[in-house]
Interface confidence: low
């Protein structure tokens, strides 16, 4: 007869490992007992369990509650056992020794491989600001056995670099994603993807990018200068910009205080019925935590009774 087993048994951490050992004997041969032991190189054999044809299963104290026979029906020639809830420390070489009658003893070895699924963690890099050079956006670390694969899934253009640290029974892989920040990246997802043979599906952790910026400021409302005449109602100037974080707006008049009756409502400056007193240079100041911008305009209120039109100057400054 001969023993049938596997060279390698692979299980995911926490699963039950079936250690196969089947005696394929001639007619009339019987199995008296099957002894299972762990036989890692450099260490003495450590008994797991003894399956006796008459007395049944005896589990050694070190494996109490963790070694069982497979559920019935059982073949009397089958010496396979279940190792419950495999942990990383179970990884190694195992041997089954089968005592048969009348053929004698046989032995076979197998290797148990315990896959340790990774626990990924994503750490964002420093605050991203438009105008920076190549900057760390995020790093992703995953440790497992064998070493996991760490990649990135994103529409954002960037570069990646990886490094790994070996442990006695596992390996940690860290991947960094670097990019040159631009405002178009705002709100874009950056996803760390961890692959591992112990995972049913890839693990994904998503980080949403935030890039600080402030766009140039401009003022709307003076496109048709002929509308800015004495007595006109509802005249207004609107300051245009955008930024992250969202900017705040402030209106001032360069050549004096804001005239009475002029209303400031965030990015909008509202005028009462126009008079010549409303002529002047108005400045919109836009700012956020990242930067500030100014845009100034010259308002000339026209007297309809005068023939000559007046020019409007638009100036933008940072």
């Amino acid at each position: 007869g001969e023993l049938e087993t596997s060279d390698v048994v692979t299980v995911v951490l926490g699963q039950d490992a079936k250690l196969p050992c089947f005696y394929r004997g001639d007619s009339g041969e019987q199995v008296g007992q099957v002894a299972w032991a762990r036989v890692d190189a450099g260490e003495g054999a450590q008994e797991l369990a003894l399956l006796h044809s008459k007395y049944g299963l005896h589990v050694s104290p070190a494996y109490e509650g963790r070694v069982e026979q497979p559920p019935p029906p059982r073949n009397p020639l089958d010496g396979s056992v279940l190792l419950r809830n495999a942990v990383q420390a179970d990884e190694g070489e195992y041997e089954c020794r089968v005592s048969t009658f009348p053929a004698g003893s046989f032995q076979a070895r197998l290797r148990l491989r315990v896959l340790v699924p990774p626990l990924p963690s994503l750490n964002p890099g420093p605050a991203l600001e438009e105008g920076q050079g190549l900057t760390l956006a995020a790093s992703c670390t995953a440790e497992g056995s064998p070493a996991p694969s760490v990649t990135w899934d994103t529409e954002v253009k960037g570069t990646t670099s990886s490094r790994s640290f070996k442990h006695s029974r596992s390996a940690a892989v860290t991947s960094e994603f670097h990019l040159v920040p631009s405002r178009s990246m705002n709100g874009q997802p950056l996803t760390c993807v961890v692959s591992h043979p112990g995972l049913l599906q890839d693990q994904r952790i998503t980080h949403i990018l935030h890039v600080s910026f402030l766009a140039e400021a401009s003022v709307r409302g003076l496109e048709d200068q002929n509308l800015w005449h004495i007595g006109r109602e509802g005249a207004m100037l609107k300051c245009l910009s955008e930024g992250q974080p969202p900017p705040s707006y402030n209106w001032t008049r360069l050549d004096g205080p804001l005239p009475s009756g002029v209303r400031v409502d965030g990015d909008t400056l509202g005028f009462p019925p126009l008079t010549t007193e409303h002529s002047g240079i108005y400045v919109c100041h836009v700012s956020n935590e990242f930067s500030s911008r100014d845009s100034q305009v010259t308002v000339d209120v026209l007297d309809p009774q005068e023939d000559s039109g007046k020019q409007v100057d638009l100036v933008s400054a940072s």
Partner: antibody, heavy 122, light 107 residues
């Protein structure tokens, strides 16, 4: 015998800072990831932060991110938690705990210190 | 974050009773689950790891079962020293999260 002894707790005003220490003995400190877990009076357990063996990689609960910093000094077998900008809701007993030595796949915690009380009040 | 929901939040039992506490995860966590026991004024103590493995030194009357989202801690015959609060904890993803606890009181 594995021992974890926390210190550094006490009464602090909102906005103040504290530094907790956890002295470890009886095991190979460098081989273990370590965590801080807290428990507000009469409440359940809340994980705060973890530092791994690998390059000191750390993770934080959202509630403390940006205010707390975990670190370790392997030469002194000591774990630290620097707590800044403290709030009333940070009031709790803070435990340091060891990640199980032979099960690096996860973060179950097999040894805990006795805890140190942090009270944030004006 | 993964939410862990324990039930019941408290129970009254007598010495010798069989006690069962359940824990449900808001998403699958394989067997990445631990059970802890905490007595008043003391630190938590690890009872069960990997959902069903008994931590060294813990009495065999404690057992754990389950995988995926539903888990159970069973005390086969409640002893006087078992009156305490029990917590489940997942560590499948960061942050690890605990159940709200189950207080086992004397009837």
């Amino acid at each position: 015998e594995v021992q974890l002894v926390e210190s550094g707790g006490g009464l602090v005003q909102p906005g103040g800072s504290l530094r907790l220490s956890c002295a470890a003995s009886g095991f190979s400190f460098t081989n273990n990831a370590m965590s801080w877990v807290r428990q507000a009076p009469g409440k359940g357990l809340e994980w705060v932060s973890r530092i791994d063996t690998i390059g000191g990689t750390s993770s934080y609960a959202d509630s403390v991110k940006g205010r707390f910093t975990i670190s370790r000094d392997n030469s002194k077998n000591t774990l630290y938690l620097q707590m800044n900008s403290l709030r009333a809701e940070d009031t709790a007993v803070y435990y340091c705990a060891r990640q199980t030595e032979d099960r690096s796949y996860g973060y179950d915690l097999d040894y805990w210190g006795q805890g140190t009380l942090v009270t944030v009040s004006s | 974050d993964i939410q862990m929901t324990q039930s019941p939040s408290s129970l009254s039992a007598s010495v010798g009773d069989r006690v069962t506490i359940t824990c449900r995860a808001s998403q699958g966590i394989s067997s990445y689950l631990a059970w802890y026991q905490q007595k008043p004024g003391k630190a938590p103590k690890l009872l069960i790891y990997a959902a069903s493995s008994l931590q060294s030194g813990v009495p065999s009357r404690f057992s754990g079962s389950g995988s995926g989202t539903d888990f159970t801690l069973t005390i086969s015959s409640l002893q006087p020293e078992d009156f305490a609060t029990y917590y489940c904890q997942q560590h499948y993803t960061t942050p690890p999260t605990f159940g709200q606890g189950t207080k086992v009181e004397i009837k």
